[in-house]
């Protein structure tokens, strides 16, 4: 059985999937539908770097760029840096500056939704 | 404004190779993925791949996966697409197409490849 | 792989009448979370290359006249020309983009009556 053919017997069980799951998917050569994607739990995708949502969608990643201000896809591009937003070769913005560093700090997050960064 | 320029008209015998250009120009050549179509005479249109400028990633419809190979020179803003083991059935005008978020939003005029004993 | 059936094959229609265009995918192509269908419908005059018209299945390029117009979502769409001009003859294809390989229909001829 191919990734895609995998994909497709087991799409109806992702939407509660945890990240550790989807880091494992990731590698199964699976090329995940946008769609699908998107009712991923938030806290689930925010986790993933850019590499792992690459090999997680595959020919799919390239939707991004026309969903990017939709949730989760919005929030997932906040907390990425912007140098492996551009490996991606989609034109998306509002990565986090390359020279900053990123704290995570739970409590600040909880409460503005977005990573707390440092200045270069 | 954009422009997609392809390299110009073949003929192949079977079993042979061709590799089409497609010069794109007018836009940032890294921020938009480029797909490659085609069209048999009369007929309609077959996705065939789409590339990654800036990683060179590429993913081709299975349909063409052991014979197609895509890829891009960033330095003079150019994707190709080669196809191997050429037959009669691959005579077709192919086209890149620029990316505008997953639909085609600029085509190249398009290369008439003719595959002929 | 999501089979695209456009219908009609051709059509004739009179300078100034409608012309109406349906594709019909095997599987929805609708986003429920962003609610974008990801269709898109192509224009194709003769001897030429492609051009958009329409994406997310009713959103018209910029430059396309407001004549043309898409509508529909999951599985059913259409292309509506509400008013032919001469300049419309083409073939005119849907494509959906929802997952690879991305796929079209088999072109509808939009001809003068």
């Known amino acids: 059985m191919n990734g895609s053919e995998y994909f497709v017997k087991i799409q109806s069980f992702l939407g509660g999937a945890p990240t550790e799951d989807l880091k494992a998917l990731s590698q199964q050569n699976v090329s995940m539908d946008l769609a699908t994607f998107m009712k991923l739990r938030t806290d689930a995708v925010l986790p993933l770097t850019v590499a792992e949502v690459q090999k997680l969608l595959g020919p799919h990643v390239e939707g991004l760029k026309a969903e990017e201000r939709h949730r989760p896809v919005r929030d997932w591009i906040l907390r990425q840096r912007q140098d492996d937003l551009d490996t991606l070769g989609l034109g998306l913005q509002g990565g986090i500056p390359n020279g900053y560093l990123v704290l995570d700090l739970s409590m600040q997050e909880a409460l503005s939704g977005t990573p707390c960064l440092l200045g270069p | 404004e954009v422009q997609l320029v392809q390299s110009g008209a073949e003929v192949k015998k079977p079993g042979a190779s061709v590799k089409v250009s497609c010069k794109a120009s007018?836009?940032?050549?890294?921020?938009?993925?480029m797909h490659w179509v085609r069209q048999a005479p009369g007929q309609g249109l077959e996705w065939m791949g789409n590339?990654?400028?800036?990683?060179?990633?590429?993913y081709y419809n299975e349909r063409f996966m052991s014979r197609v190979t895509m890829t891009v020179d960033k330095s003079t803003s150019t994707a190709y697409m080669e196809l191997s083991s050429l037959r009669s059935e691959d005579t077709a005008v192919y086209y890149c197409?620029?990316?505008?978020?997953?639909?085609?939003?600029?085509w190249g005029q398009g290369t008439l490849v003719t595959v002929s004993s | 792989d999501i089979v695209m059936t456009q219908s009609p094959d051709s059509l004739a229609v009179s300078l100034g009448e409608r012309a109406t265009i349906n594709c019909k995918s095997s599987?929805?192509?609708?986003?429920?979370?962003?609610?974008?269908?990801?269709l898109a419908w192509y224009q194709q005059k003769p001897g030429q290359s492609p051009t958009l018209l329409i994406y997310?299945?009713?959103t018209r390029e910029s430059g396309v006249p407001d004549r043309f117009s898409g509508s529909g979502s999951g599985t059913d769409f259409t292309l509506t020309i509400s008013s032919l001009q001469a300049e419309d003859v083409a073939v005119y294809y849907c494509?959906?983009?929802?997952?690879?390989?991305?796929?079209f229909g088999g072109g509808t001829k939009v001809e003068i009556k």
């Open positions: 599987q929805t192509l609708l986003n429920s979370v962003s609610q974008n269908n990801y």
């Open positions: 007018g836009y940032t050549f890294t921020n938009y993925w």
């Open positions: 590339i990654n400028p800036s990683s060179g990633d590429s």
């Open positions: 997310f299945a009713s």
């Open positions: 197409a620029r990316s505008g978020g997953l639909w085609l939003a600029f």
């Open positions: 494509q959906q983009h929802y997952r690879t390989p991305y796929t």
